[in-house]
Interface confidence: low
Amino acid sequence: WERSLAGAEETIPLQTLRCYNDYTSHITCRWADTQDAQRLVNVTLIRRVNEDLLEPVSCDLSDDMPWSACPHPRCVPRRCVIPCQSFVVTDVDYFSFQPDRPLGTRLTVTLTQHVQPPEPRDLQISTDQDHFLLTWSVALGSPQSHWLSPGDLEFEVVYKRLQDSWEDAAILLSNTSQATLGPEHLMPSSTYVARVRTRLAPGSRLSGRPSKWSPEVCWDSQPGDEAQPQNLECFFDGAAVLSCSWEVRKEVASSVSFGLFYKPSPDAGEEECSPVLREGLGSLHTRHHCQIPVPDPATHGQYIVSVQPRRAEKHIKSSVNIQMAPPSLNVTKDGDSYSLRWETMKMRYEHIDHTFEIQYRKDTATWKDSKTETLQNAHSMALPALEPSTRYWARVRVRTSRTGYNGIWSEWSEARSWDTESVLPMW
Amino acid sequence: WERSLAGAEETIPLQTLRCYNDYTSHITCRWADTQDAQRLVNVTLIRRVNEDLLEPVSCDLSDDMPWSACPHPRCVPRRCVIPCQSFVVTDVDYFSFQPDRPLGTRLTVTLTQHVQPPEPRDLQISTDQDHFLLTWSVALGSPQSHWLSPGDLEFEVVYKRLQDSWEDAAILLSNTSQATLGPEHLMPSSTYVARVRTRLAPGSRLSGRPSKWSPEVCWDSQPGDEAQPQNLECFFDGAAVLSCSWEVRKEVASSVSFGLFYKPSPDAGEEECSPVLREGLGSLHTRHHCQIPVPDPATHGQYIVSVQPRRAEKHIKSSVNIQMAPPSLNVTKDGDSYSLRWETMKMRYEHIDHTFEIQYRKDTATWKDSKTETLQNAHSMALPALEPSTRYWARVRVRTSRTGYNGIWSEWSEARSWDTESVLPMW
């Protein structure tokens, strides 16, 4: 808000106006207007000669503004010369600007028909178990005036959940300075916001418009089961579609999949609605939408609609999701060489082939740098010549490998270590 | 909008579930839930043994998730072992998750009481001189159904100037697919925007809620005098203040200062309201506000209010805004030296003192680097010794300097130049 007292000089012509005289024969005035203003209105410099006589002053366009700066980028400077025969030390000239046509607007205001009652103040919320009491006050001027009485007023309370828009807010009318919101008005475990405005009661002798809205007040509604889907609403388009929407907490939706189920009559079979469309609703909720077909509204005029957890199942076929137990591994020495031998837990089904992956490495290497061998249905493997006086490690894992059977590698067997013997020197 | 078919696997437990068996004695399952979901609901892994038998699976917390990645930062991994005696190549296990309590909500929808009529389409505007015709269409399904008929519907047209909020928009009701907006509805030279929604007519057998709003349509109202102040509105608070506001184009406000004038009765004197508060309104307008005191609403119930250009005057006192005509300057040579002589235009008032500012310089210098002298009431000045064989320039200006008189310097006189004589050599 910018504030200006009546009389504050604020227009560009008046700001830029400077007049100097030679104290002998003439007064020279300079001022500027803007190109933008000129498109809509032209103003004329007016000199007030005396109380009754206003004279327009003839001015020419000018190239410069030596006496003042113009506070606008597109100024149009002007210069005016006013002949003047006599100058006295007490002389004061009064200059103003006049638009080129009458500008203005007029209104006859009958107070009784142009009332905007005062807005409610001190809006507060207090709670009594699962009921919430909104209270406020309204200043009606001095009691002795009685021009506007409480009987002329009513209050419009609008309230909504934080995530909803005011356009979809619910309205409650009250003819006192309070209103109660109970479980029938509020969804549990939700943050609500309310505001109130004063309006003229229908039976009042007064008319006008409602007050401004009060500041808002916020509160949390009665606690409830936050995992429950909320706000299931369905509306029929009058033709062939019943559109339903409901809301679920985002965290719950990540763990429980809800579906919309419907029956066109109590004894009909239940069907699931598809597809379901989802949209975010604030940071906490997801809104779901689904359209139920209504082939015959005249015959089936009542639908039973429910939101329930969907039995979303994962089908896992045993024969292609096998992970065998890890083999047990041993190291044996045969003369100068070493062998790895392993056993698998006995399977009930002999016909299933096994693939083994064997890894061995020096103690100083990592498994990533190990030697890897793959063998089919074998239970041992002779190791090639190894470096003497070195510690080695080995491990083995297994998976099924017959057509029609599949799965993932078993865990690795427990790793085994051994030290190779030192080689005697040749001397 | 995100779309999901009924049956799409979307929950984190189902996404992360992996089950592998050793094809001999047991199945191992791993899955994850989120900490956030656990605050609100716990889910249990369920194995469907056959069509009728669902068995909960006992699971333990786990440190890792070797078989799948969790798409959430705060996952809680679990591992479950299910003993199993027989495996057949055709075996399929069916797994799902079940919340720890019944979740869901239910609604019985009577179609006649849950109607949301279709939203208007093809909203268009056409013009006939200063009247604007809004037309739209609405799809009511197949004509043979007749479930929802045109008689069940009415249309709510809301319209506003572009810069106003929808909350303050005007409403027009129509029981056909058109509405006319004339000069009584629209301010001239303004851009308007309108939208329409369908609602159930008061006399209809149906109930529910209005349709969504149609897309908006924009148009420019009938041309008018854009310099005129617009939208003068006044509302009485019922106690002691009549608050008025009006709007002016920003360009016009820069050149014409408007005031709010009021009379508490037709024969009372007109007074000006102060202070006026201003605020921007879109890019083109400024809204002005002022509060008129209403000392006695019972006696004076009708105020005549007008917005008019204010006679904002600038008072300019002649004797302190003098700019004399520039002096006329001559250069004379007296023997070896030079003098400057000037004359001022004769003033009618001999008693007014004059101050002169004299500047002289070499031809090669600028006025900025010139020598400057100031003299009181003198009309000549002897120049000091000058360099020989050099061109010089001089100029003079004047201002009044008597107490009680003031102003600004005159323009500079016309500059005069002269060449100094060459000095004969000494030999």
Partner: antibody
Framework: QVQLVESGGGLVKPGGSLRLSCAAS????????MSWIRQAPGKGLEWVSF????????YYADSVKGRFTISRDNAKNSLYLQMNSLRAEDTAVYYC?????????????????WGQGTTVTVSS | EIVLTQSPGTLSLSPGERATLSCRAS???????LAWYQQKPGQAPRLLIY???SRATGIPDRFSGSGSGTDFTLTISRLEPEDFAVYYC??????FGGGTKVEIK
């Protein structure tokens, strides 16, 4: 029943004065705006003046402005029209009428109750 | 000042016929502000229609009003003998139209 009865008409010379009265009964007079309407012989209806329920708001037709004064006394359920500087063209039947009630004055319910009229003749 | 012009000046019809009376305003009038009256010789006028289209209490449904902006219409669907009279339109609390006389043909 709801009724309006005018009185005070008669013959008067140009420049003279008359005071018409309208007595209301059968409704809450103080809730309603009231009007005077006249009808010159063989001519149409011409609105003369109206007054708001409280008496604060008053309007006159240009043809009578400055000569006629409308007033009401809610305690007596009466409406008045003081006519000064009468002219020949003021000759007419004068009706008082009630404006249909509405809490919102931007809606007009018409003049729903009329008196039977009183005749004013201005002639020398 | 708004001027209301009624046409035709006289309408000659037989009982049972449909009568359509027109009222045209010199500038746009809110339909909320337009009323129609019936006046029979020697009687006070009687309110028929207010708000351009709403019937006053006790008015038969053969009388209907319509229109908006500058053009308004009073329609009598089937003339009864008691409907032959002069009809006036009126804007808000003030201006009346010149009247249309509906006479028996």
């Amino acid at each position: 029943q709801v009724q309006l009865v005018e009185s005070g008409g008669g013959l008067v010379k140009p420049g003279g004065s008359l005071r018409l009265s309208c007595a209301a009964s059968g409704f809450t007079f103080s809730d309603y705006y009231m009007s005077w309407i006249r009808q010159a012989p063989g001519k149409g209806l011409e609105w003369v003046s109206f007054i708001s329920s409280s008496g604060i708001i008053i309007y006159y037709a240009d043809s009578v402005k400055g000569r006629f004064t409308i007033s009401r006394d809610n305690a007596k359920n009466s409406l008045y029209l003081q006519m000064n500087s009468l002219r020949a063209e003021d000759t007419a039947v004068y009706y008082c009428a009630r404006r249909g009630y509405s809490g919102y004055d931007y809606y007009y319910y018409g003049l729903d109750v009329w008196g039977q009229g009183t005749t004013v003749t201005v002639s020398s | 000042e708004i001027v209301l012009t009624q046409s035709p000046g006289t309408l000659s019809l037989s009982p049972g016929e449909r009568a359509t009376l027109s009222c045209r305003a010199s500038q746009s009038v809110s339909s909320s502000y337009l009323a129609w009256y019936q006046q029979k010789p020697g009687q006070a006028p009687r309110l028929l229609i207010y708000g351009a289209s709403s019937r006053a209490t006790g008015i038969p449904d053969r009388f209907s009003g319509s229109g908006s902006g500058t053009d308004f219409t009073l329609t009598i669907s089937r003339l009864e003998p008691e409907d032959f009279a002069v009809y006036y339109c009126q804007q808000y609390g003030s201006t009346f139209g010149g009247g249309t006389k509906v006479e028996i043909k």
